[in-house]
Amino acid sequence: HTAAQDNCTCPTNKMTVCSPDGPGGRCQCRALGSGMAVDCSTLTSKCLLLKARMSAPKNARTLVRPSEHALVDNDGLYDPDCDPEGRFKARQCNQTSVCWCVNSVGVRRTDKGDLSLRCDELVRTHHILIDLRHRPTAGAFNHSDLDAELRRLFRERYRLHPKFVAAVHYEQPTIQIELRQNTSQKAAGDVDIGDAAYYFERDIKGESLFQGRGGLDLRVRGEPLQVERTLIYYLDEIPPKFSMKRLTGGGSGGGSHHHHHHHHHH
């Protein structure tokens, strides 16, 4: 696994322990919490990052209307079970034997049950809608400039192939970034949209996962973009399975500063 050879650190994941004990004395980095070896030339999977985090001390509408099946991460942080590749296991359980099924980004997609709950497969999240509201700025953002800058960010910072950034919508002050990646589209070595979205989410919160970098400075023709609130919607290849009681009881909570956790239903 590649890492900075001179000081043996992981540029793409600061939640690691690195030492020059790899083949030929090469720097090898392992994720905190799981101890799994990570590839420091690309993003670390969200599952391993969550595990590491838990182990650490503690009108004319151009905007997209999320579908009725869109999920928002309502449950917040938990200590996940990851498979040998670092992906989320389809079934997650807590210490009190409460279990639930998750999608490929680790968001619960069923009601909670007991140890008898079956999750036959890990359902892929193929469409992620990142909904941002930016702070008022002295200078207005041009849509095409904003589009180009966000695409550059996902390409350069998160190493996400440009074809997976489906669209950038802008209706001041709301910005929406659509990421799409079907199972058939994702080739070996491609960054997963779920991992890219998670790194972006942490950057937006001022909690960068990259080693030694300052906070994300995102500018559009020199004008800084500051984010006041973020909501992320996840759409799965197979719709989630929640009881009718859940679907009819409640609606959506409001989104204020950063990532509010709730399932979103219209």
């Epitope: 002295a138 400075d217 500018r219 023709r221 800084p224 500051q226 984010v227």
Partner: antibody, heavy 122, light 106 residues
């Protein structure tokens, strides 16, 4: 540490131009904009504009448009502010100041250069 | 342009006293920035985004406010705090500063 060092004092005649430099060190030069602010004798602070070294974007105060030009030399981490058609009321101390920002915060103008006194006199 | 009016123009206080400086905007702004300037020196950032203390600034300085009314408070004046203080807005161009409040020794 982050530091901005400006060129020395200048004395100019009315109608002439002045070019003040501001050399940055201690940070990634292309990562933040450089603003120019002046203070006339006995007056308050007046913002003139900024330039963003990464792509050369700039924003000028309309009051100075047509008279002010900001340029950047990334090879020497230096920004220049040129003010033309000088008049006596342009006599002031001219400051450069960098503005760091992230998606979370705008960190204001910090630090500032030591200032360059420009005297316009016939 | 947004006009920032600072009051009072001069504040005469003794060391140890509390200083309250006001900045009023001609139209609503989201954030205010505060700077300190001493004779012969460049301005120094004190507060960013209305209430956040800049690096190396003592905790006796604090900022608050919203909309059109903002305040800089120095809880207990130290001898080195006697200076001119400016507020600044970044809400719309041109960026503007207040005319300053001079805090002088009584």
């Amino acid at each position: 540490q982050v530091q901005l060092v400006q060129s020395g004092a200048e004395v100019k005649k009315p109608g002439a131009s002045v070019k003040v430099s501001c050399k940055a060190s201690g940070y990634t030069f292309t990562s933040s904009d450089i603003n120019w602010v002046r203070q006339r004798p006995g007056q308050g602070l007046e913002w003139m504009g900024w330039i963003y070294p990464r792509d050369g974007s700039k924003k000028y105060n309309e009051k100075f448009k047509g008279r002010v030009t900001m340029t950047v030399d990334t090879s020497t981490s230096t920004v220049y502010m040129e003010l033309s058609s000088l008049r006596s009321e342009d006599t002031a101390v001219y400051y450069c100041a960098t503005r760091f920002a992230t998606v979370v915060s705008n960190y204001g103008l910090d630090p500032w250069g030591q200032g360059t006194l420009v005297t316009v006199s016939s | 342009e947004i006009v920032l009016t600072q009051s009072p123009a001069t504040l005469s206080l003794s060391p140890g006293e509390r200083a309250t400086l006001s900045c009023s905007a001609s139209s609503s702004v989201n954030y205010i920035y505060w700077y300190q300037r001493k004779p012969g020196q460049a301005p120094r950032l004190l507060i960013y985004d209305t209430s956040n203390l800049a690096s190396g600034i003592p905790a006796r300085f604090s900022g608050s406010g919203s909309g059109t009314d903002y305040t800089l408070t120095i809880s207990s004046l130290e001898p080195e705090d006697f200076a001119v203080y400016y507020c600044q807005q970044w809400n719309s161009y041109p960026l503007t500063f207040g005319q300053g409040t001079k805090v002088e020794i009584k």
